[in-house]
Structure formats: structure tokens, C-alpha cells
């Protein structure tokens, strides 16, 4: 049994880091493998993660962590029984993938303005809470070409757009994702999408 593709890990910088790797053949990850992880600091405890299958030869492990800070550095040991298959390290702050924003809502009752709001996925005491910026994706269910991205570079989890920038009388969907420049993170996954019917009063034509 050998590791074909070494584990790579990403952290949500809150409580979970996810490591994925591939074996050289079909493997029952949960029965054959264990991923041990431990902070490099004095007296830290070693923890065991039981991996799950992720495709035939792929494995994924969700490492539980508390109160992640930039100094944290973990040793990782991948074991198959008594055999050490791979040894490495992982610094969560250098491999951050933020949590996806939630509760995306489209408020359509504000004159001819669409107000999109969502929730910051982090609690206020987490470092990322005040460092997230967002991308909002809006697309038409009827017209695949009607697809747009709005970059929200301010901290407030909301976006206002004129309803007239979208076509009237058709349904649209929106979703939002986040990233943090401070840790050069990857983008989060997209939030679940929300749907609304776009309609607004056309201004009277002037003759």
C-alpha cells in the first residue's frame, strides 16, 4: 500500500481542516488508514482522524481544531496499521479556504432596487470576520449568457443593484462566495443559491 498523491490540506480557519490524498489502488480509507495530527507546541495532544473514501483510491479526512491562530503548525502522520506511509506538516494559516457565506436573501420591495444580504460565516471573535470580501454571482435561469459577477470589496455583507440592470419579467438566481486577502486564501465554496422573479416598472417613454 502506497500513497500516490500526498495529502493536501485546507483550513476554514475556525474549527475544521480538510485533507485529501490518493492511494495507489482502491482502498477502504476508514478501515485501513489513520491520519494522526498534532500541534508542534509543547504538551499538545496527538489526535486521530478517521478518513472517508473520496472516489476509489481517494481519501478525505476532516481534522477538528480549536481556536486556530497564525502560529499553529501541525505534524501529520498517515498510518496503515503499524506502517507509516507518509509524514508531513500543515500550517492552517497558509492554506485557508473560508467557509461559505449563508442566509442569502434578495429583498425586492425597496422601490426599484434589489438588496441582496447574506451572513458572514464567522463569529465576531474570529480573525477572518473583519477581513472577508465577497463575489456575488447573478444569473438568469432562462438565458445562460445572462451571467454576471459583482465584487463586493467592502466589509458589509450586502449588495444593492438597480432592478433595471436585469431583465424584467424573468427569474434570476444569486449565490455568494468569500475570500480574505490578508491570508491570500482561496475562494470559499458558493453559498446555496436563492431565486427571485425580477419585475420593475418601466419608466414612461418621453415623446
Amino acid at each position: 500500500m502506497k500513497v500516490l498523491q500526498e495529502p493536501t490540506c485546507v483550513s476554514d480557519y475556525m474549527s475544521i481542516s480538510t485533507c485529501e490524498w490518493k492511494m495507489n489502488g482502491p482502498t477502504n480509507c476508514s478501515t485501513e488508514l489513520r491520519l494522526l495530527y498534532q500541534l508542534v507546541f509543547l504538551l499538545s495532544e496527538a489526535h486521530t482522524c478517521i478518513p472517508e473514501n473520496n472516489g476509489g483510491a481517494g481519501c478525505v479526512c476532516h481534522l477538528l481544531m480549536d481556536d486556530v491562530v497564525s502560529a499553529d503548525n501541525y505534524t501529520l502522520d498517515l498510518w496503515a496499521g503499524q506502517q507509516l506511509l507518509w509524514k508531513g506538516s500543515f500550517k492552517p494559516s497558509e492554506h485557508v479556504k473560508p467557509r461559505a457565506p449563508g442566509n442569502l436573501t434578495v429583498h425586492t420591495n425597496v422601490s426599484d432596487t434589489l438588496l441582496l444580504t447574506w451572513s458572514n460565516p464567522y463569529p465576531p471573535d474570529n480573525y477572518l470576520y473583519n477581513h472577508l470580501t465577497y463575489a456575488v454571482n447573478i444569473w438568469s435561469e432562462n438565458d445562460p449568457a445572462d451571467f454576471r459577477i459583482y465584487n463586493v470589496t467592502y466589509l458589509e455583507p450586502s449588495l444593492r443593484i438597480a432592478a433595471s440592470t436585469l431583465k424584467s419579467g424573468i427569474s434570476y438566481r444569486a449565490r455568494v462566495r468569500a475570500w480574505a486577502q490578508c491570508y491570500n486564501t482561496t475562494w470559499s465554496e458558493w453559498s446555496p443559491s436563492t431565486k427571485w422573479h425580477n419585475s420593475y416598472r418601466e419608466p414612461f417613454e418621453q415623446h
Epitope: L39, V40, F41, L43, E45, V69, S70, A71, N73, S93
Partner: antibody, heavy 120, light 107 residues
Framework: EVQLVESGGGLVQPGGSLRLSCAAS????????MSWVRQAPGKRLELVAA????????YYADSVKGRFTISRDNSKNTLYLQMSSLRAEDTAVYYC?????????????WGQGTSVTVSS | DIQMTQSPSSLSASVGDRVTITCQAS??????LAWYQQKPGKAPKLLIY???NLETGVPSRFSGSGSGTDFTFTISSLQPEDIATYYC?????????FGGGTKLEIK
């Protein structure tokens, strides 16, 4: 309100023993890593000993290894430092501290300190 | 052991001044560094952990930065109650070690 109250300090002759105690309240003692830090006159702060939450793992500074023993009683919310074969260089104010995380790192709560003087 | 060199060892500043203290580690300590404030006759108090994280309840005029071997502690606008000795503390290497302290006085 978090409180760490040390007791047991005093004057002791070289070669003698002392047992320091630290009564903790205001936080979940049984899940906290704890430690003892000392501050000798004109010397740097020094982490003397540390212990994990269940008492199963300990750390000692080289200067006290084999002479000091850190322990805890989670049912009494109390941390201890048994000091034996005391030397003049052990003279210091001893602080009971709580580790901020589940490892030896930054210390977020400190007691008021108890003074230990080793002298003949 | 990792040596922590703090500078200056003492400094005098006026109320409202921006005050900067530096701490240099003899080898890489990542961002495993804390800053403490100790007032005369009192126990040290944690201000900053993990090099730049402000401890809960600590005024925002205190800040920390740096990684590796070079660290900075800053008071953006000195207040009379900030008169104290400040210590850095690395906990990346074993044993954990402290700086010699910086005594801050008011002009």
C-alpha cells in the same frame, strides 16, 4: 471573574522543600492547561513547569527537572508545585498561570504570585 | 535555547506618543510570540498572542506585528496607565523563553 490564588510560599533553607498551591475559579479548570512561571530579582521570567488538562503530561524547565513536580486535582480546582532540594537560585515570585490553548503557549490568566526565598 | 532580545531596555515617552518596542529571536519562532504588560507589584497581563492577535478586553491602541525572528509591539497613543514593563515571549521552541523587558516611563 477568573481568579488564580497562590499560597504556600515562604522562607526555606537550601535543600529544603515547599509545596505551592493555586486555587482556581471563574473558568473550567478541568479543561485548561496550567503552568507555573517564576520571576527572580533581576532575572527574566521563566516557565518552570506546565501540565495538561488531565494531568497526564507535564513539562519542566531543565533548571528544575528532578527537583520540582507539578500536579493538579481537578475535583478541587487546584494546581500544585512540589519543590524539593531547593537552591538559592530558586528564590523568586512564583505565578500560577493558565495556558491560553491546549498546549504550552501564551498565558492568559495569572495569579498575584507567591514569594519563595531560599536562604540560610 | 532561543534567545529573545528586546529593545530598548527602557524608554521615556509623552502621553499621546506612538511607542514602539522590538523583540528579536535568535532563530525562527514563526508567529508563536506573545506580549505581556507588568505593572509594579502586579502579575504580568497578556496583551497580544500569536504575534498580532489582541487579547479580549485589551484596548485597541495596543498592537503587534512580525513573524520569523523580528517582532514589533506598538502603543499608538500612550496613556498614563500604560506605564509598565513589557515582555515578549516565544513559545515555538523548547524551552519557551522571555525577553528581558522594556521599562516604559512617562516624560
Amino acid at each position: 471573574e477568573v481568579q488564580l490564588v497562590e499560597s504556600g510560599g515562604g522562607l526555606v533553607q537550601p535543600g529544603g522543600s515547599l509545596r505551592l498551591s493555586c486555587a482556581a475559579s471563574g473558568f473550567t479548570f478541568s479543561s485548561s492547561y496550567m503552568s507555573w512561571v517564576r520571576q527572580a530579582p533581576g532575572k527574566r521570567l521563566e516557565l518552570v513547569a506546565a501540565i495538561n488538562s488531565n494531568g497526564g503530561k507535564t513539562y519542566y524547565a531543565d533548571s528544575v527537572k528532578g527537583r520540582f513536580t507539578i500536579s493538579r486535582d481537578n475535583s478541587k480546582n487546584t494546581l500544585y508545585l512540589q519543590m524539593s532540594s531547593l537552591r538559592a537560585e530558586d528564590t523568586a515570585v512564583y505565578y500560577c498561570t493558565r495556558q491560553r490553548g491546549n498546549y504550552v503557549g501564551a498565558m492568559d490568566y495569572w495569579g498575584q504570585g507567591t514569594s519563595v526565598t531560599v536562604s540560610s | 535555547d532561543i534567545q529573545m532580545t528586546q529593545s530598548p531596555s527602557s524608554l521615556s515617552a509623552s502621553v499621546g506618543d506612538r511607542v514602539t518596542i522590538t523583540c528579536q529571536a535568535s532563530q525562527d519562532v514563526s508567529t508563536a510570540l506573545a506580549w505581556y504588560q507588568q505593572k509594579p507589584g502586579k502579575a504580568p497581563k497578556l496583551l497580544i498572542y500569536s504575534a498580532s492577535n489582541l487579547e479580549t478586553g485589551v484596548p485597541s491602541r495596543f498592537s503587534g506585528s512580525g513573524s520569523g525572528t523580528d517582532f514589533t509591539f506598538t502603543i499608538s497613543s500612550l496613556q498614563p496607565e500604560d506605564i509598565a514593563t513589557y515582555y515578549c515571549h516565544q513559545y515555538y521552541g523548547s524551552p519557551p523563553t522571555f525577553g528581558g523587558g522594556t521599562k516604559l516611563e512617562i516624560k
